[in-house]
């Protein structure tokens, strides 16, 4: 007896983080034997949608012409072949931005920081929110989470960086999110440029010297210096 059908691949174009009102296409790719594709959305009646395969039958397209809150969430897809249904795909988390107005991102004491010193990025919301996310542009793992515990909402989250090195430099934005759904994010904050200058103790590497061997914020989470200032907030990384 043949083993289980291989799971399909699920992805979104142009990406899985979509601004409110923009279009997004979800693709599910199975095998050439697929006869039907099914898309399930977590906490929605299954199936969320069904599509016939596109030629040459190894994938199907699920179109969202205008992104709204209803489409944000966690999806899986399946395909049906003559021998039955496949295993589910790995989940796709479709996130919508623009659900809330933008927070304010600042650097304390300053966005100009000397290598080896400390800096704290502060994301502030004028209304209470329960999750704050810090994103660095062009980072492999850009999300740093601060999420409140016990539903206690906060107006701000602090992201300490210490000691700062040249790889911390770059452009950051933050988002905030409400308890309604963690798939709904605010508009992005205005960008903050963090500029790291060298010091006598820790000279800035020359352009010819590789710094990729030192794990920076792109490669591993920034560990907090001491406790998170707002006790209702718990630190998470993704």
């Amino acid at each position: 007896q043949a083993g289980p059908l291989p799971k399909p691949t699920l992805w979104a174009e142009p990406g899985s983080v979509i601004s409110w009102g923009n279009s997004v296409t979800i693709w599910c790719q199975g095998t050439l034997e697929a006869r039907e594709y099914r898309l399930d959305k977590e906490e929605s009646p299954a199936p969320w949608d069904r599509q016939n395969p596109l030629e040459p039958k190894n994938k199907a397209r699920f179109s969202i012409p205008s992104m709204t809150e209803d489409y944000a969430g966690r999806y899986r897809c399946y395909y049906r072949s003559p021998v039955g249904w496949s295993q589910p795909s790995d989940p796709l988390e479709l996130v919508m931005t623009g659900a809330y107005s933008k927070p304010t991102l600042s650097a304390l004491p300053s966005p100009l920081v000397t290598s080896g010193k400390s800096v704290t990025l502060l994301c502030q919301s004028r209304s209470p929110m329960d999750t704050f996310l810090l994103i660095k542009e062009r980072a492999a793992h850009p999300l740093l989470h601060l999420r409140s515990e016990h539903g206690a909402q906060q107006h701000q989250a602090e992201f300490p960086m210490s000691p700062v090195t040249s790889v911390h430099g770059g452009t950051y934005r933050c988002f905030s999110s409400h308890g309604f759904s963690h798939y709904l994010l605010s508009h992005p904050s205005d960008p903050l440029e963090l500029i790291v200058s060298g010091s006598l103790e820790d000279p800035r590497p020359s352009p010819t010297r590789s710094v990729s061997t030192a794990a920076g914020p792109e490669d591993q989470p920034l560990m907090p210096t001491g406790s998170v200032p707002h006790s209702g907030l718990r630190r998470h990384w993704e």
Partner: antibody, heavy 120, light 110 residues
Framework: EVQLVESGGGLVQPGGSLRLSCAAS?????????ISWVRQAPGKGLEWIGS?????????YYATWVKGRFTISRDNSKNTLYLQMNSLRAEDTAVYYC???????????WGQGTLVTVSS | DIQMTQSPSTLSASVGDRVTITCQAS??????LAWYQQKPGKAPKLLIY???TLASGVPSRFSGSGSGTEFTLTISSLQPDDFATYYC????????????FGGGTKVEIK
């Protein structure tokens, strides 16, 4: 020109209802702003009524004294904000303003105000 | 709740005087404080935001200072056009607030 224009004020009897409108021009209510309603009774100070977030979810917050009598809503297609006022009392007589919270968290744009008089 | 207490409620002064108005928050509001000027029959006008930043078009005789819970609006040399009522306001929005404004300070001619 960037502006807010209130309308819908007038004379209403105690216990009655009224809906005020705040039309935005020169910017979109669905961009990243909060909009508040503020009132000022004759000879008194400014009093915050409530606010609505321009994000798609449209979170609203109200002053504690509102106690469900007032409701803020919006119609993005008309770029207009509303204040529905029910169970009106004489002490609700005031000039009602809508105002935009800028990036600096301050009210950087105000309407001209509309007068609501609650009297029998 | 965040209460904003403004003082004095009335201030009598003369042209050329240095005038100081204070605003106290019942808990820290960081630097999220704004000051407004209002004249009879008109909407309030933003003077200062983020405690100390002058709004566009506001004369430099106006200045703001403070952070946390104590804030000050100063008019270095009072001009005839400055006789008005001034309000402070914190920038937070949430459901446990009675008001976001201070009670106001009327600056009148001595």
């Amino acid at each position: 020109e960037v502006q807010l224009v209130e309308s819908g004020g007038g004379l209403v009897q105690p216990g009655g209802s009224l809906r005020l409108s705040c039309a935005a021009s020169g910017f979109s209510l669905s961009s990243s702003y909060w909009i508040s309603w503020v009132r000022q009774a004759p000879g008194k100070g400014l009093e915050w009524i409530g606010s609505i977030d321009s994000g798609s979810v449209g979170i609203t917050y109200y002053a504690t004294w509102v106690k469900g009598r007032f409701t803020i809503s919006r119609d993005n297609s008309k770029n207009t904000l509303y204040l529905q006022m029910n169970s009106l009392r004489a002490e609700d007589t005031a000039v009602y303003y809508c105002a935009r919270h800028g990036d600096n968290w301050a009210l950087d744009l105000w309407g001209q105000g509309t007068l609501v008089t609650v009297s029998s | 709740d965040i209460q904003m207490t403004q003082s004095p409620s009335t201030l009598s002064a003369s042209v050329g005087d240095r005038v100081t108005i204070t605003c106290q928050a019942s808990q820290s509001i960081n630097s999220w404080l704004a000051w407004y000027q209002q004249k009879p029959g008109k909407a309030p006008k933003l003077l200062i935001y983020k405690a100390s930043t002058l709004a566009s078009g506001v004369p430099s005789r106006f200045s703001g200072s403070g952070s946390g819970t104590e804030f000050t609006l100063t008019i270095s040399s009072l001009q005839p056009d400055d006789f008005a009522t001034y309000y402070c306001q914190h920038g937070y929005i949430r459901g446990d607030l009675d008001n976001v404004f201070g009670g106001g300070t009327k600056v009148e001619i001595k």
